[in-house]
Interface confidence: low
């Protein structure tokens, strides 16, 4: 099953369908009963299970924090996917919250990259083009930029 | 409340072989995936074995040829064989279990354990 095979109407949880394991694991949207007789299906937009699998039960969706907006909804076969709103982003080294842009570059650099969900403003020195990277500068030294309205990090 | 407890670590010689062993307790309805994790100084941790309940496991690289995870779901128990030690396994290692407790509908995947010791040296 794919997120496109999905009918909008299967957002209403059905009843628990089952059918019986292939070699010892069920397929992509369901689990397998404590027996491992059966394979259950996963409850469409409370659980969802990847692959192939030998789970005793489906793995439950992410629900987006404040400060995230939902890209798409939680499948019985593909989580939630969620990303930071505009204005904010996440890091690589904190992943689990959502940072606010920088409105500005420091004195004596320009900005060559715009807010995204996955970054902060870029900023290269005018003369040498060296990327900056460190705190957010003091307002008075900054060259304001309009990244869109900031959000509050995500909790 | 669940509790995991580790035990069975200690110093070891290269080469030498070691079974640690993790209990898990409390008000526990189902045990979905159980694993071994290690820790050593000034690193990440990072996943050394796991096991589903249905005894499907997944080894880190390294690890492969050298470790065993087993697990006994009646006794809610996870196991990890260490053989042909080497100074570079010497780490805390940690037990986890993603766990559904009594009259809960999700398993949480974050329940560890305190931790025990292994050092390998001669």
């Known amino acids: 099953i794919t997120q496109q095979d999905l009918a909008p109407q299967q957002r209403v949880a059905p009843q628990q369908k089952r059918s019986s394991p292939s070699e010892g694991l069920c397929p992509p949207g369901h689990h397998i009963s404590e027996d491992g007789r059966d394979c259950i299906s996963c409850k469409y937009g409370q659980d969802y299970s990847t692959h192939w699998n030998d789970l005793l039960f489906c793995l439950r969706c992410t629900r987006c924090d404040s400060g995230e907006v939902e890209l798409s909804p939680c499948t019985t076969t593909r989580n939630t996917v969620c990303q930071c709103e505009e204005g904010t982003f996440r890091e690589e080294d904190s992943p689990e919250m959502c940072r606010k842009c920088r409105t500005g570059c420091p004195r004596g650099m320009v900005k060559v990259g715009d807010c995204t969900p996955w970054s902060d403003i870029e900023c290269v020195h005018k003369e040498s083009g060296t990327k900056h990277s460190g705190e957010a500068p003091a307002v008075e030294e900054t060259v304001t930029s309009s990244p869109g309205t900031p959000a509050s990090p995500c909790s | 409340e669940v509790q995991l407890v580790e035990s069975g670590g200690g110093l070891v010689q290269p080469g030498g072989s070691l079974r640690l062993s993790c209990a898990a307790s409390?008000?526990?309805?189902?045990?979905?995936?159980m694993g071994w994790y290690r820790q050593a100084p000034g690193k990440q941790r990072e996943l050394v074995a796991e096991?589903?309940?249905?005894?499907?496991?997944n080894y880190a690289d390294s690890e492969k040829s050298r470790f065993t995870i087993s697990r006994d779901n009646a006794k809610r128990t996870v196991n990890l064989q260490m053989n042909s030690l080497k100074p570079e396994d010497t780490a805390v290692y940690y037990c986890?279990?993603?766990?559904?407790?009594?009259?809960?509908?999700?398993?949480?995947?974050?329940?560890w354990g305190q931790g025990t010791q292994v050092t390998v040296s001669s």
């Open positions: 986890n279990a993603e766990v559904r407790e009594r009259g809960t509908s999700w398993y949480r995947p974050d329940y």
């Open positions: 409390g008000s526990i309805d189902s045990i979905n995936n």
């Open positions: 096991i589903t309940p249905r005894g499907r496991t």
